[in-house]
């Protein structure tokens, strides 16, 4: 999906209003310095691409974040403010249902959510030059 036509300001407002708080809740008990940010993004569409990938694609050591509250809200925000996003996700959702596993918060998942926090922060500051 090409995130170029999303309403970035609305997605930013949704993040600041509620998604950010859910990410903090997920990470509660973890020091903010515990993980290094290794994933970066260069502009808002790129940030949303990386956010979608890290939130919804299973990775080794972190089978699924998709049922976490921050993920459900992220999916909803993209569905509302990215035209056509919902339609592109129907097949992906059906595939995900088949391989759904029970929720387990592993250290790898905590690291992944820490990366997500960094991507969201970057998304909210689009005019900053890449380090």
């Amino acid at each position: 999906y090409d995130f170029t036509n999303c309403d970035f300001e609305k997605i930013k407002a949704a993040y600041l209003s509620t998604i950010s708080k859910d990410l903090i809740t997920y990470m509660s008990g973890t020091k903010s310095t515990e993980f290094n940010n290794t994933v970066s993004c260069s502009n808002r569409p790129h940030c949303l691409t990386e956010i979608q990938s890290l939130t919804f694609n299973p990775t080794a050591g972190c089978a699924s974040l998709a049922k976490e509250m921050f993920a459900m809200k992220t999916k909803a925000a993209l569905a509302i403010w990215c035209p056509g996003y919902s339609e592109t996700q129907i097949n992906a959702t059906q595939a995900m249902k088949k391989r759904r596993k029970r929720k387990v918060t592993t250290n790898k998942c905590l690291e992944q959510v820490s990366q997500l926090q960094g991507l969201w922060r970057r998304f909210n500051r689009p005019l900053l030059k890449q380090q």
Epitope: K10, A13, A14, S17, T18, K73, A76, A77, A79, I80
Partner: nanobody
Framework: QLQLVESGGGLVQAGGSLRLSCAAS????????IAWFRQAPGKEREGVSF????????YYADSVKGRFTISSDNAKNTVYLQMDSLKPDDTADYYC?????????????????????????WGQGTQVTVSS
């Protein structure tokens, strides 16, 4: 241009009722979501209720569930908030607000409808005072 005009506020005794109206003009009403917010003196603006004009889906704040009812008359481009069993705590300025994408994505909007930062257009407000 897009305009929202509220009416129906006033002074009422505890236990009484009021019906607020939000008349909209200047946009395709059917595609929009309309929400009611309220703000009491010294407090933050809070979401009261939401309706999708495309499918009629409605959401309510816990504090008004069972007492307030939101409805929409698409022919008149007007949204109503019927407020029953009013309490002194309901005293506030009431505002209606419109947003252009949540109206056609009402199921996904359950997470976001109550956040004022997401709305593009606002009315000037109507005052509701509930005396004990």
């Amino acid at each position: 241009q897009l305009q929202l005009v509220e009416s129906g506020g006033g002074l009422v005794q505890a236990g009484g009722s009021l019906r607020l109206s939000c008349a909209a003009s200047g946009f395709n009403f059917d595609d929009y979501a309309i929400a009611w917010f309220r703000q009491a003196p010294g407090k933050e603006r809070e979401g009261v209720s939401f309706i999708s004009n495309s499918d009629g889906t409605a959401y309510y704040a816990d504090s008004v569930k069972g007492r307030f009812t939101i409805s929409s008359d698409n022919a008149k481009n007007t949204v109503y908030l019927q407020m029953d069993s009013l309490k002194p705590d309901d005293t506030a300025d009431y505002y209606c607000a419109a947003e252009g994408r949540m109206g056609t994505h009402s199921r996904d909007s359950v997470y976001f409808w109550s956040f004022s930062a997401l709305y593009d257009y606002w009315g000037q407000g109507t005052q509701v005072t509930v005396s004990s």
